[in-house]
Amino acid sequence: APPPINKLALFPDKSAWCEAKNITQIVGHSGCEAKSIQNRACLGQCFSYSVPNTFPQSTESLVHCDSCMPAQSMWEIVTLECPGHEEVPRVDKLVEKIVHCSCQACGKEPSHEGL
Amino acid sequence: APPPINKLALFPDKSAWCEAKNITQIVGHSGCEAKSIQNRACLGQCFSYSVPNTFPQSTESLVHCDSCMPAQSMWEIVTLECPGHEEVPRVDKLVEKIVHCSCQACGKEPSHEGL
C-alpha cells in the first residue's frame, strides 16, 4: 500500500489528523461485574481520493484511502469477578490497550499485536 | 453500513469534506494518440475511528471508516485516433465521468456503475 498522505498540494491548508483520545471503557461479561478501565480510542480525518477509471484500464485504478486506526496496541488481561458463578468465580478478558494511532491504508488490518 | 459521519461531538470544530475537483485527464491506448478531456476527481477528509476491541468480544467491533469516492458517475465513449493501425484506425475507450462525490463507507464499492 502507498504511504499515508499527510498533506495535499491542492489543499495546502488541510492536514490529515488521527488522535488517540483517552476514554473510559466498560469491560463486561455475562454474569460478571463490569469493570471500568482507562483506555484510548483512535479518531481522525485522513485523506482519501478517487481518480476516474477507464475501460480498458490504462493504469492501476487511482484510488487512495487512509483510515485512522491503531498503530500500536497491546493486549492486557482484565479479570472480572463473577459472584453468581460458583464454578467460575472469575473470568479473564483480553482488552486491547491502544498506545497510539495513525492514518493507515483502509484495507490494512489494524496492528492488533496478538489477535 | 452506518450512514457517513459529517460531525463529531468530540470535535465540534471539525467537519468531514469530500469535493469533486476539476481535472484534465489524459486518455490513452497502446498505438493511439492520447486525448485530454475535462473530468473530475474526488478528494477529501472523511471521519474514521476505532474503539478498542476485547476478547471475547462483548459487542460488535466499534470501527468506522468513511472514504471520499464517486457518489454519481456515468461512462462515456472517448474515441482515439490510431494512425499506426490500419486494421483498427480508431479505438473507443470508456471513461468514467464523475458527477459528484461524497463520504461513503470504506468497504463500499464506489458507484463505478459498470466496472
Epitope: P56 | H29, M74, W75
Partner: antibody, heavy 120, light 111 residues
C-alpha cells in the same frame, strides 16, 4: 475470419451458478482493439448486453447484472468465460458471445448462441 | 422495457421499401453512434450497419442507416423474401446505468 463458439451446460438449477465458455478461432483474443462480449436473449424477446472484457482482463459489466456477473479471459486457450451466480428462471435465455470491434457500439462477430434453461 | 424504442412490426410487398425507426435520448443515440443488426429466424444476429451509416463488407447497399438527433432509421429497399427477420438497433448509453443498449426489435414481414 474470426469464429466464436459457446459451450457449457444447457440446464442449470435455480440458485446455482451458470458457467459458459467462448472459444475463439481464426484470430487471437490478445490482439488489441477488440472487446469481447456476452449478450443474452430471453425466449421470444430482445437482446440484453451482459458485459465486456479486454484481453488484459479489464472488465465492464451491465450495471443491472453487475452484482452477479464475472467475465474472465484465458489468453493461452484463446477463450473467455461468463459466470452468472444465483440464477433464477428469469435467466433462461440464449447466451451469445461476441467480438465488439474497437468501436464499442459495433458488435461485428457473434457466436451461434447456446440455450441455457434454469429449472429444478 | 427497452431503452431504445422500435415499432414491433413493419411489412411491405417484395421490391418495396421499408423503414424502421429507433428512438432514444441524448444520453444514447443523441451522443453516440448507432448500429443495426439483422436476426434471421433461429440464427444469431448479424451486423448490418455501424457508425450510423456505414456497412460492413458483404452487406448489400439495399440496407442503409441514418441518424438525426435522438432517432435513427434503417432503410431496406428492393425488399426480398430473405429479408424477413427481426431487426435491432443498438448504441451506447452514458446515463447513470451506462451500458450497451438495444431496441426491442422490429419484425419485418414480406407480404
Amino acid at each position: 475470419e474470426v469464429q466464436l463458439l459457446e459451450s457449457g451446460p444447457g440446464l442449470v438449477k435455480p440458485s446455482q451458478t451458470l458457467s459458459l465458455t467462448c472459444t475463439v478461432s481464426g484470430g487471437s483474443i490478445s490482439s488489441g482493439g477488440y472487446y469481447w462480449s456476452w449478450i443474452r436473449q430471453h425466449p421470444g424477446k430482445g437482446l440484453e448486453w451482459i458485459g465486456y472484457i479486454y484481453y488484459s482482463g479489464s472488465t465492464y459489466y451491465n450495471p443491472s447484472l453487475k452484482s452477479r456477473v464475472t467475465i474472465s479471459v484465458d489468453t493461452s486457450k484463446n477463450q473467455f468465460s461468463l459466470k452468472l451466480s444465483s440464477v433464477t428462471a428469469a435467466d433462461t435465455a440464449v447466451y451469445y458471445c461476441a467480438r465488439t470491434n474497437s468501436r464499442i457500439t459495433m458488435i461485428a462477430d457473434w457466436g451461434q448462441g447456446t440455450l441455457v434453461t434454469v429449472s429444478s | 422495457q427497452s431503452v431504445l424504442t422500435q415499432p414491433p412490426s413493419v411489412s411491405a410487398a417484395p421490391g418495396q421499401k421499408v423503414t424502421i425507426s429507433c428512438s432514444g435520448s441524448s444520453s444514447n443515440i443523441g451522443n453516440n453512434y448507432v448500429s443495426w443488426y439483422q436476426q434471421l429466424p433461429g440464427t444469431a444476429p448479424k451486423l448490418l450497419t455501424y457508425d450510423n451509416n456505414k456497412r460492413p463488407s458483404g452487406i448489400p447497399d439495399r440496407f442503409s442507416g441514418s441518424k438525426s438527433g435522438t432517432s435513427a432509421t434503417l432503410g431496406i429497399t428492393g425488399l426480398q423474401t430473405g429479408d424477413e427477420a427481426d431487426y435491432y438497433c443498438g448504441t451506447w448509453d452514458s446515463s447513470l446505468s451506462a451500458g450497451h443498449v438495444f431496441g426491442g426489435g422490429t419484425k419485418v414481414t414480406v407480404l
